[in-house]
């Protein structure tokens, strides 16, 4: 039977090394066996390159294309082939369809003044355009109470967030994750980072306990929990 595309390719670029296109066929398809996505930069002398797609679902194909460090002027010609049959043809400008890389290495540390310090890494090297363009969203949620969650927008440069322990329930286990976007590129959000989990030990003032003592104890507790969490 004839091969048809149900949802045409939608593509995003991390604006440093990879562009990813995804599309849906009208019936279950062995993407790598039946289809090829050719791509070519609209630039004098550029060669044609071929991407072998993989299945994301029965009828959904995805292709990851290595690209050079992207610049605004880059435009790619894309052609989706089933053998000799051209199924779809289009163009793709990475700078207009940015999906940032996922922030990495999210960690939580007890900090002075009864706060938690959340830290993560900017996924771009300093020389990349996006390094200084990223803002972040941090999601903090109570592992045992779906209603207890907070969202923090980090619009300043440093990939850190200070969180007052008093804003979280004492004795509860919390998870945090972070994602990024680039406002000047009108990007989509990145994928969420893997979650990191910690126990929030905070005693209200009226308990007359030394909070610094509690935080010192929490450092030990947190290290034990974090060690346990990452080995299971």
């Amino acid at each position: 039977g004839s091969v048809k595309v149900l949802h045409e390719p939608s593509c995003f670029s991390d604006y440093i090394s990879t562009s990813v296109c995804q599309w849906k066929m009208d019936h279950p398809t062995n993407c790598s066996a039946e289809l090829r996505l050719s791509y070519q930069l609209d630039f004098m002398g550029s060669e044609n390159h071929t991407c072998v797609p993989e299945n994301r679902e029965d009828s959904v194909c995805v292709c990851s294309m290595p690209i050079d460090d992207a610049v605004e002027a880059d435009v790619y010609q894309l052609d989706l082939w089933a053998g000799q049959q051209l199924l779809w043809s289009g163009s793709f400008q990475p700078s207009k369809h940015v999906k940032p890389r996922t922030p990495g290495n999210l960690t939580v540390h007890p900090n002075i003044s009864h706060t938690w310090l959340l830290m993560w890494t900017n996924p771009y090297p300093t020389e990349n355009h996006l390094h200084s363009e990223l803002t972040y969203m941090v999601n903090v949620s109570n592992d045992n109470d779906p209603e207890d969650f907070k969202v923090y927008n980090v619009t300043y440069m440093g990939p850190t967030l200070r969180l007052a322990a008093s804003t979280l329930k004492s004795g509860a286990s919390y998870s945090a994750r972070v994602r990024a976007w680039a406002q000047t590129y009108n990007s989509t959000w990145s994928d969420w980072s893997p979650s990191t989990t910690w126990l929030n030990y905070y005693e209200p003032w009226e308990q007359h306990l030394g909070l610094n003592d509690i935080f010192e104890a929490q450092k030990i507790e947190w290290h034990e929990h974090h060690h346990h969490h990452h080995h299971h």
């Epitope: 930069l41 002398g45 060669e47």
Partner: antibody, heavy 125, light 112 residues
Framework: EVQLVESGGDLVKPGGSLRLSCVAS????????MTWVRQAPGKGLQWLSL????????YYADAVKGRFTISRDNAKNTLYLQMNSLRAEDTAVYYC??????????????????WGQGTLVTVSS | DIVMTQTPLSLSVSPGETASISCRSS???????????LDWYMQKPGQSPQGLIY???KRASGVSDRFSGSGSGADFTLKISRVEADDAGVYYC?????????FGQGTKLEIK
């Protein structure tokens, strides 16, 4: 050492044909686009044609489009220019030159970084 | 097609002085920041051309630092400082971004 040696230049009558060759050595020929440039007696340089490293993409100046064909044989490290329907105004020294690196997604550009010694084509009755 | 216009078409300079040649394109040659697809070539009588500057300001291998290129967009300049007798020849600019590629008319540099 990079070397480009052109050959095939000759005296030919108007309407005739000629094939120029350019043998390359000293670099990875298949990785680079190649270009032909000509220079009429006492005149300036005129760009003619470019071919990508694989040979899959070709470009031409309007003055030669439809009459000249650029090609390459990467196994022989040789660039060609097939010239048909020659005219008196095609009389010139023809140079081959190494152009951009095309094995990368966006070609890396160094200008025409090495030129051959040229071969003379004379079109006259 | 893109028109490349060089000025002046001839230039006479004394040894030790600075020579300056301008090249203007009818279309921008800037692909992205720092990537200006404009080259400069020199040709001596009876010889093949040789590359001096590529991407607007990058010196080709083995080229003296007396040769410098500048500019962006559609306006570019080649400067030759402390001119020597051996610098005599014809200088060409060439755009390497848009097909068809093209050269300027050439500037003949004469050393007094």
């Amino acid at each position: 050492e990079v070397q480009l040696v052109e050959s095939g230049g000759d005296l030919v009558k108007p309407g005739g044909s000629l094939r120029l060759s350019c043998v390359a050595s000293g670099f990875t020929f298949r990785d680079y686009a190649m270009t032909w440039v000509r220079q009429a007696p006492g005149k300036g340089l005129q760009w003619l044609s470019l071919i990508s490293g694989s040979g899959g993409k070709t470009y031409y100046a309007d003055a030669v489009k439809g009459r000249f064909t650029i090609s390459r044989d990467n196994a022989k490290n040789t660039l060609y220019l097939q010239m048909n329907s020659l005219r008196a105004e095609d009389t010139a020294v023809y140079y081959c030159a190494v152009d951009r690196l095309t094995k990368t997604i966006r070609p890396q550009y160094y200008g025409l970084w090495h030129w051959g010694q040229g071969t003379l084509v004379t079109v006259s009755s | 097609d893109i028109v490349m216009t060089q000025t002046p078409l001839s230039l006479s300079v004394s040894p030790g002085e600075t020579a300056s040649i301008s090249c203007r394109s009818s279309k921008s040659l800037t692909y992205s920041i720092g990537y200006n697809y404009l080259d400069w070539y020199m040709q001596k009588p009876g010889q093949s051309p040789q590359g001096l500057i590529y991407l607007g300001s990058k010196r080709a291998s083995g080229v003296s630092d007396r040769f410098s290129g500048s500019g962006s967009g559609a306006d570019f300049t080649l400067k030759i400082s402390r001119v020597e007798a051996d610098d005599a020849g014809v200088y060409y600019c060439m755009q390497g971004l848009h097909s068809p590629l093209g050269f300027g008319q050439g500037t003949k540099l004469e050393i007094k």
